[in-house]
């Protein structure tokens, strides 16, 4: 159950995709991929008040108790539902191959 | 690729499953579910150091850039890899009703 | 099979706008950048510049600075692109390629589309 | 704007004969692992580009291994090892290094 996309806290301060611009430094690839040699890395930000996007009934059962304890029991969290497929050039023993990686890249966001 | 199990914040700190007692009203269900009358909700709690149960590649990522730019990037959450299935006891128009759900209660954690 | 369609040829009027397509199929369209290309008749290649269908972003050659626009559907997996204020040094095939980044080799390309500008 | 220069900017060669063609760059492609960001392309008359070999040396699928590309920093080199009649195309060579990516002006091949 996909709950409401409208976000209590202001505009872009709830959870949605982000990117950002990273070199392969930054993600400690430079010693195996060759290219791209930056990546813009889309990835889910923001905060996930009561029932924002709501992944599942888990979701929901954690923004309740969240309320009630707030310091035994997290908010819920802005992680992807889906992802994007990435293809890296990638450095093998033998020369270089094509990867495509279905677990890199946010594509979409929820909360859980 | 689930990372490395030991908690470099000390035993119990890290990404794990905890079980928090609920009543009906706490969950909010009272009006709506007969059985059972207290829930052991289990869920998944903790922090995510760096690689500490990362989920995907996404997860790799994450770490990386939260090193980096701790202000902008979140570290990974704890979230629930899987769920165990739970039967409720609900009211309905006509009278009651067995349901299970497959998305109410983590059965495994990792970091995303 | 891995291709990129494009429409055969466009015929418009100087000053004006056209904007082309450019589909993807047999791969997931949001995982390799696609770069456009310019070769004017009898001519060499020129780099127009790229755009991520992931994100939307684009990036391109200074020298097509406030000349092109780069679009994408990614419910249709499409890559679009628009060349405004049109004149005879327009007339060119226009391909586009699929490029795993921004600075990769571009492995599949469109049989391109043919532009003439002329009144 | 890294300038590309290719020669001879045509040539005529026998069926089965031995071609080698330049490619020059007023930069260093180099980047690390020893790789250089220079890919070579074929161009028949009447078709897009193709592929034949990508950071400095990989053939892409599907190219025969009579074509083969070597060099480093600023100077590359294209050879042919025994010219087929199909070979008969326009040879690019393309510098991904920096942007703006730029190409040779090419090197018509013409078959005796």
């Known amino acids: 159950a996909r709950n409401g996309d409208h976000c209590p806290l202001g505009p872009g301060r709830c959870c949605r995709l982000h990117t950002v611009r990273a070199s392969l430094e930054d993600l400690g690839w430079a010693d195996w991929v060759l290219s791209p040699r930056e990546v813009q890395v889309t990835m889910c930000i923001g905060a996930c008040p009561s029932q924002f996007r709501a992944a599942n009934m888990h979701a929901q059962i954690k923004t309740s108790l969240h309320r009630l304890k707030p310091d035994t029991v997290p908010a819920p969290c802005c992680v992807p539902a889906s992802y994007n497929p990435m293809v890296l050039i990638q450095k093998t023993d033998t020369g270089v191959s094509l990867q495509t990686y279905d677990d890199l890249l946010a594509k979409d966001c929820h909360c859980i | 690729a689930r990372n490395g199990d030991h908690c470099p914040l000390g035993p119990g700190r890290c990404c794990r499953l905890h079980t928090v007692r609920a009543s009906l009203e706490d969950l909010g269900w009272a009006d709506w579910v007969l059985s059972p009358r207290e829930v052991q909700v289990t869920m998944c709690i903790g922090a995510c150091p760096s690689q500490f149960r990362a989920a995907n590649m996404h997860a790799q990522i994450k770490t990386s850039l939260h090193r980096l730019k701790p202000d902008t990037v979140p570290a990974p959450c704890c979230v629930p890899a899987s769920y165990n299935p739970m039967v409720l006891i609900q009211k309905t128009d006509t009278g009651v009703s067995l349901q299970t759900y497959d998305d109410l209660l983590a059965k495994d954690c990792h970091c995303i | 099979q891995v291709q990129l369609q494009q429409p055969g040829a466009e015929l418009v009027k100087p000053g004006a706008s056209v904007k082309m397509s450019c589909k993807a199929s047999?791969?997931?369209?949001e995982g390799w950048y696609i770069h456009w290309v310019k070769q004017r008749p009898g001519q060499g290649l020129e780099w127009m510049g790229w755009n991520n269908p992931r994100t939307g972003l684009t990036n391109h050659a200074q020298k097509f600075q406030g000349k092109v626009t780069m679009t994408r559907d990614t419910s249709s997996s499409t890559a679009y692109m628009q060349l405004s204020s049109l004149t005879s040094e327009d007339s060119a095939v226009y391909y586009c390629?699929?490029?795993?980044?921004?600075?990769?080799?571009?492995?599949?390309w469109g049989q391109g589309t043919t532009l003439t500008v002329s009144s | 704007d890294i300038v590309m220069t290719q020669s001879p900017s045509s040539l005529s060669v026998s069926a089965g004969e031995k071609v080698t063609m330049s490619c020059r760059s007023s930069?260093?492609?180099?980047?690390?692992?020893?790789?250089?960001?220079l890919d070579w392309y074929q161009q028949k008359p009447g078709q897009p580009p193709k592929l034949l070999i990508y950071?400095?040396?990989n053939r892409a699928h599907g190219v025969p291994d009579r074509f083969t590309g070597s060099g480093s920093g600023t100077d590359f080199t294209l050879t042919i090892s025994s010219v087929q009649a199909e070979d008969l195309a326009v040879y690019y060579c393309m510098q991904s290094f920096e942007t703006p990516i730029t190409f040779g002006g090419g090197t018509k091949l013409e078959i005796k």
């Open positions: 950071l400095d040396r």
């Open positions: 047999g791969y997931p369209f």
């Open positions: 930069q260093s492609l180099l980047w690390k692992h020893g790789y250089n960001y």
């Open positions: 390629a699929r490029g795993v980044g921004a600075d990769a080799a571009f492995d599949i």
